[in-house]
Amino acid sequence: PKQTLPKPIIRAESTYMVPKEKQATLCCQGSYGAVEYQLHFEGSLFAVERPKPPERINGVKFHIPDMNSRKAGRYSCIYRVGELWSERSDLLDLVVTEMYDTPTLSVHPGPEVTSGEKVTFYCRLDTATSMFLLLKEGRSRDVQRSYGKVQAEFPMGPVTTAHRGSYRCFGSYNNYAWSFPSEPVKLLVTGDIENTSLAPTDPTFPDSWDTCLLTRETGLQKDLALWDHTAQNHHHHHHHH
């Protein structure tokens, strides 16, 4: 069998959901000494980066300006050290948002419920879309999908305080082209946990693993600020179809 280098890690900086006309940044973490990185899009070569000097950094950032539906889709990357190529990275789905229209998100029976109550979110968009997506802030990898002509239901079942947080929905024109986000709906769950006022809520900042921390090779500092490898469990297959 042909010898290959270990596969790189591909990640979107900040978010994999990029508003149209904004810049997407994809990071490919390979190896110190890599002389070339290739970004592939839907199985075809998209861009090539040859870092200078090659031996000083363990990855590269591919900047994709002017995001649009033609650049949205599945990306992967590979790298080369000498004449030896790596295996291909996992796939990363890059989504363009702020396309066309804005849906409306509502929640039944209301935004303030008691633990154990059944809650359903409704996402409505009066344009040609049949797939809807519900995301919780700070949990953008956990996308819930539902289908409907102009409205989709997202039954949450009996909720707990873990469901507390801010939610948004999108209409999807295809797997990689989403509408503008809805206005957020904040779900407040009061419950039978002792001292619910101190129960933790989910962070509303972007997913902590959506960060590119490429490191320069500087002797003793080489091992500092390495990528958060706990994130590797989250970054791929985040919303495969």
Epitope: F46, A47, V48, E49, F62, I64, P65, D66, R70, K71
Partner: nanobody
Framework: QVQLVESGGGLVQAGGSLRLSCAAS????????MGWFRQAPGKEREFVAA????????HYADSAKGRFIISRDNAKNTVSLQVNSVNLEDTAVYYC????????????????????WGQGTQVTVSS
């Protein structure tokens, strides 16, 4: 906004050489990765060669390696494609394209990554 105008096409004999040029308008030319694509009759548009905004990095299609040389002059806002030992399969419309890149060492290859396109110049190779 970048406007691209190709020149240098025409009728060339097999075995000869030609040089295609692309003139770009605008003061931001040095921020763009530049590429050449071609489309033969009845075929899809295909990547030929590309060069990074700095000119330091080039990338060629397998079919172009060895015979094609891409270069650029950021002072003159031009990118050129030298084609040597032309053959009948090189008959096509050749397009120049510009891709905005954030890094001087990035080369864009995929047509979807290009923001601006020229109108093309016809190259016909005769035997």
């Amino acid at each position: 906004q970048v406007q691209l105008v190709e020149s240098g096409g025409g009728l060339v004999q097999a075995g000869g050489s030609l040089r295609l040029s692309c003139a770009a308008s605008g003061r931001t030319f040095s921020r763009y990765s530049m590429g050449w694509f071609r489309q033969a009759p009845g075929k899809e548009r295909e990547f030929v060669a590309a060069i990074s905004s700095s000119g330091d990095v080039t990338h060629y299609a397998d079919s172009a390696k060895g015979r094609f040389i891409i270069s650029r002059d950021n002072a003159k806002n031009t990118v050129s494609l030298q084609v040597n030992s032309v053959n009948l399969e090189d008959t096509a419309v050749y397009y120049c394209a510009a891709s905005l890149t954030a890094r001087a060492t990035t080369v864009t290859v995929h047509p979807n990554g290009y923001n601006y396109w020229g109108q093309g110049t016809q190259v016909t190779v005769s035997s």
